[in-house]
């Protein structure tokens, strides 16, 4: 069973840095949850190293991770989703390092998808919509979304808008005319569960209309 390494019982192993980080994804495959861990140092020799989680599990003491290249992975229904689990890096029966982690505080949502932008000529605005699989989930249902957009020529000049819904209106007058824009969105847990930003959705590209010289307004695309 996993426990904290005692001083002096690890010989040469304790000279290495086995620090690691993990994230959980709840109901990522039907009712199955996942937990993914990886070493922070990409140069760690992972040969013979295993990960094990003990505690805060349903009707089992511990679970072993599967190794997929340089990441370690569990898919299971057996997370209690309350309290701290003990996650350990092991060589055989020896624990090299352990962390107590509450899996509800390291949740990484799935990336939003189906991002699109529709121009409304009469309203002189752009309606941004996207979808998230979390609307159908039992647990991580409440998310904060971060919509980021930029003019394609402005490499690092992103404008960010935080919202809790999956619809956003961008006013035409706030955007440059006749310009190509890139827009993307990501999500983070926002109620009970805590954790990390999801991956970004695939980017969507749209062009703003030209300015209509007589009225000073943009022409529709």
């Amino acid at each position: 069973e996993s426990g904290y390494a005692q001083n002096g019982d690890l010989e040469d192993a304790e000279l290495d840095d086995y620090s690691f980080s993990c994230y959980s994804q709840l109901e990522v495959n039907g009712s199955q949850h996942s937990l993914t861990c990886a070493f922070e140092d990409p140069d760690v020799n992972t040969t013979n190293l295993e990960f094990e989680i003990c505690g805060a599990l349903v009707e089992v003491k511990c679970l072993n991770f599967r190794k997929l290249q340089e990441i370690y992975f569990i898919e299971t229904k057996k997370f209690l989703l309350i309290g701290k689990s003990n996650i350990c890096v092991k060589v055989g029966e020896k624990s090299l390092t352990c962390k107590k982690i509450d899996l509800t505080t390291i949740v990484k949502p799935e990336a939003p998808f189906d991002l699109s932008v529709i121009y409304r000529e009469g309203a002189n605005d752009f309606v941004v919509t996207f979808n998230t699989s979390h609307l159908q989930k039992k647990y991580v249902k409440v998310l904060m979304h971060d919509v980021a957009y930029r003019q394609e020529k402005d490499e690092n000049k992103w404008t960010h808008v935080n919202l809790s819904s999956t619809k956003l209106t961008l006013l035409q007058r706030k955007l440059q005319p006749a310009a190509m824009y890139e827009i993307k969105v990501r999500s983070i847990p926002d109620h009970y569960f805590k954790g990390f930003w999801s991956e970004w959705s695939p980017s969507y590209y749209f062009r703003t209309p030209e300015i209509n010289n007589s009225s000073g307004e943009m022409d529709p695309i």
Partner: antibody
């Protein structure tokens, strides 16, 4: 003050079922597991199972599967344990106990509910 | 399943005497907890995660151990320490030891 208020003693007939309640106060009910423990003959303690009050997820000792069913009512911060198909072996004191999720020990206990199964 | 064996089952100590109660696990465990129970009352958390004293527990109590062997020690027995002490495994299925009854000699 953190408290767990359990329902009163019960005298039930063999084959019957019954439900014990445990009302929590003084803390966030959904932030801790609720555990149930059986004490027979004033000595042996046996963990029956637990419930996550936020999600309703349960975990049972295999010895009590089919014997106990754990539920919660979040609106009243009350946990329940239903005992099924009672026999004389089920005569005992039953405790609810809050689970500290940082260390997995039972940090607050109810006063216990005495269940006597007799015809 | 982890089996916890406490010894002795019953022991008596004089006031001021040092007392040690042991808990032996059938296989290696990471953490152990201890509870105190007096007649007619519910168990009280006493020592958690091997050596941390629960709120209100006197400093004369201590806990130690690793692997399969854990112990609760009272440095100087007092009358109020007479009780049954239970060890408990930290993980599923949260097994308890059979208890050690500590009496005053």
């Amino acid at each position: 003050e953190v408290q767990l208020q359990q329902s009163g003693p019960e005298l039930v007939k063999p084959g019957a079922s019954m439900k014990i309640s445990c009302k929590a106060s003084g803390y966030s009910f959904t932030g801790y597991t609720m555990n149930w423990v059986k004490q027979s003959h004033g000595k042996n303690l046996e963990w029956i199972g637990l419930i996550n009050p936020y999600s309703g997820i349960t975990s049972y000792n295999q010895n009590f599967k089919g014997k106990a069913t754990l539920t919660v009512d979040k609106s009243s911060s009350t946990a329940y344990m239903e005992l099924l198909n009672l026999t004389s072996e089920d005569s005992a004191v039953y405790y609810c106990a809050r689970g500290d999720g940082n260390y997995w020990y039972f940090d607050v206990w109810g006063a216990g509910t005495t269940v006597t199964v007799s015809s | 399943e982890i089996i916890l064996t406490q010894s002795p089952a019953i022991t008596a100590a004089s006031l001021g005497q040092k007392v040690t109660i042991t808990c032996s696990a059938s296989s290696s465990v990471s953490y152990m907890h201890w509870y105190q129970q007096k007649s007619g009352t519910s168990p009280k958390p006493w020592i958690y995660e091997i050596s941390k004293l629960a709120s209100g527990v006197p400093a004369r109590f201590s806990g130690s151990g690793s692997g399969t062997s854990y112990s609760l020690t009272i440095s100087s027995m007092e009358a109020e320490d007479a009780a049954i002490y239970y060890c408990q495994y930290w993980n599923y299925p949260y097994t308890f030891g059979g208890g050690t009854k500590l009496e005053i000699k």
